[in-house]
């Protein structure tokens, strides 16, 4: 019972995590304009992995996709790759884990086969979560580096009368969504791996009892033995569960308006 709960919870946590990774990857707010030096701006900039956007205080928002591959920074490409790998691995992991769930019966699948599938999906979730965390962290590091570089530039060469305010970017909502989602996927993966240990049947060593029949001897092993390699049938009736989990729609939280007072 505890194994089923651990497996089920691991699946749900991973599902939420992967939904979050997908949401974070699609979100436009990976980096948002830092308003510390200019809190009264009437134009707000924010950027995602796929496009950059400008929201005017009049309410109009214009987004432009990055219609180039070669012109983009290698780091951005790396982050995209990490997030996509995370999503793909997570999606495959979800597919595998659905069939591995103890509460779902598919044909005459052995518990040991389910254990292997649970372990496989768990490892996939762990790698998926690590990919997301790595991707978000690389992007965050890139932001921090650029932030301090632009800060250094901001305070040099300002001897003239004309002031040029350089746009600096800080952490956007997508980074936090990505970190949390990656963490959830990782935790879900660990839970699946723990559940796998409980699912794998312990190998019971029965002593073979020899019965001497006339003419030849036959070694008979009681039917209760199941090899750890996962052969043998499991005929117990199990409740069939459709596993129809639903992901919430992505909701983008926009930065609050910085009113001029």
């Amino acid at each position: 019972m505890a194994v089923t709960a651990c497996q089920g919870l691991g699946f749900v946590v991973s599902l939420i995590g992967i939904a979050g990774i997908i949401a974070a990857t699609c979100m436009d707010q990976w980096s948002t304009q830092d308003l510390y030096n200019n809190p009264v701006t009437a134009v707000f900039n924010y950027q995602g992995l796929w496009r950059s956007c400008v929201r005017e205080s009049s309410g109009f928002t214009e987004c432009r996709g990055y219609f180039t591959l070669l012109g983009l920074p290698a780091m951005l490409q790396a982050v995209r790759a990490l997030m996509i790998v995370g999503i793909v691995l997570g999606a495959i992991g979800l597919l595998v884990s659905i069939f591995a769930l103890k509460c779902i019966r598919i044909g005459s699948m052995e518990d040991s086969a389910k254990a292997n599938m649970t372990l496989t999906s768990g490892i996939m979730f762990i790698v998926s979560g690590l990919c997301a965390i790595a991707g978000v962290s690389v992007f965050a590091n890139m932001l921090v580096t650029n932030f301090w570089m632009s800060t250094a530039n901001m305070y040099t060469g300002m001897g003239g009368m004309v002031q040029t305010v350089q746009t600096r970017y800080t952490f956007g909502a997508a980074l936090f969504v990505g970190w949390v989602a990656g963490g959830l996927t990782l935790i879900g993966g660990v839970m699946m791996c723990i559940a796998c240990r409980g699912l794998a049947p312990e190998e019971t060593n029965y002593k073979a009892v020899s019965y001497h029949a006339s003419g030849h001897s036959v070694a008979y092993k009681p039917g209760g033995f199941k090899a750890s390699t996962g052969f043998g049938s499991n005929t117990k009736n199990k409740k069939i569960y459709d596993g129809g989990a639903r992901t919430e729609d992505e909701v983008q939280s926009y930065p609050s308006k910085h009113d001029y007072v």
Epitope: Q33, T41, A42, N45, S58, G59, T164, K257
Partner: antibody
Framework: QLQLQQSGTELVRPGSSVKISCKAS????????MNWVKQRPGQGLEWIGQ????????KYNGNFKGKATLTADKSSSTAYMQLSSLTSEDSADYFC???????????WGQGTTLTVSS | DIVLTQSPSSLTVTAGEKVTMSCKSS????????????LTWYQQKPGQPPKLLIY???TRDSGVPARFTGSGSGTDFTLTINSVQAEDLAVYYC?????????FGAGTKLEIK
């Protein structure tokens, strides 16, 4: 077509208050910021502030904080500006204007002339 | 606050001439996010409210004659009227649309001989 119709000329005593109206028609009033601009006789334009009728959000020019109060009535598609503690310095033409793409004022009211005199 | 300095304060021209007026900003009005300059030009004829001519420094509003052209970037902007008409007699204002408070230039008064 799109129109911003402002209330008529006002002649008031110093120290009193006045409420100028701007009735919008021909567009979704709640979805656009409404701005107020002051123009003293023979002078330039001065932005007072803006209100978003959809939720009542306001932004003010610091010079007019405490002087002007912006409100809006969605049901009648009308924006209001109340000016308090009036002095001769407040004698001017006041325009309402819709805020549009590019953070510009694309449609303007015909203006309300306020004269503060004892 | 951003200060906009317009020059000249007034100019008199003959119909058909080309006119240029300047607007200088105390801060850059160029937004790096979309590479657009948040400067607007308005025309105010005597006894009328201002009328939008150009936004984003160079985008003409619908219905504005092609003889009106906005140019410039960062802190220096220009409004050009090719072949001035008698009906162009007005005061022309530039406006900062980049930072609150939204500010206007003092205006350039165009007079026709």
């Amino acid at each position: 077509q799109l129109q911003l119709q402002q209330s008529g000329t006002e002649l008031v005593r110093p120290g009193s208050s006045v409420k100028i109206s701007c009735k919008a028609s021909g567009y979704a009033f709640s979805n656009y910021w409404m701005n107020w601009v002051k123009q003293r006789p023979g002078q330039g334009l001065e932005w007072i502030g803006q209100i978003y009728p959809g939720n009542g959000d306001t932004k003010y020019n610091g010079n007019f904080k405490g002087k002007a109060t912006l409100t809006a009535d969605k049901s009648s598609s009308t924006a209001y500006m109340q000016l308090s503690s009036l002095t001769s310095e407040d004698s001017a033409d006041y325009f309402c204007a819709r805020y549009y793409r590019g953070n510009c004022f694309d449609y303007w009211g015909q203006g309300t002339t306020l004269t503060v005199s004892s | 606050d951003i200060v906009l300095t317009q020059s000249p304060s007034s100019l008199t021209v003959t119909a058909g001439e080309k006119v240029t007026m300047s607007c200088k900003s105390s801060q850059s009005l160029l937004n790096s996010g979309n590479q657009k300059n948040y400067l607007t030009w308005y025309q105010q004829k005597p006894g009328q409210p201002p009328k939008l001519l150009i936004y984003w420094a160079s985008t003409r509003d619908s219905g504005v004659p092609a003889r009106f052209t906005g140019s410039g970037s960062g802190t220096d902007f220009t409004l050009t009227i090719n072949s001035v008409q008698a009906e162009d007699l007005a005061v022309y204002y530039c406006q900062n649309a980049y930072t609150y408070p939204l500010t206007f230039g003092a205006g350039t008064k165009l007079e026709i001989k």
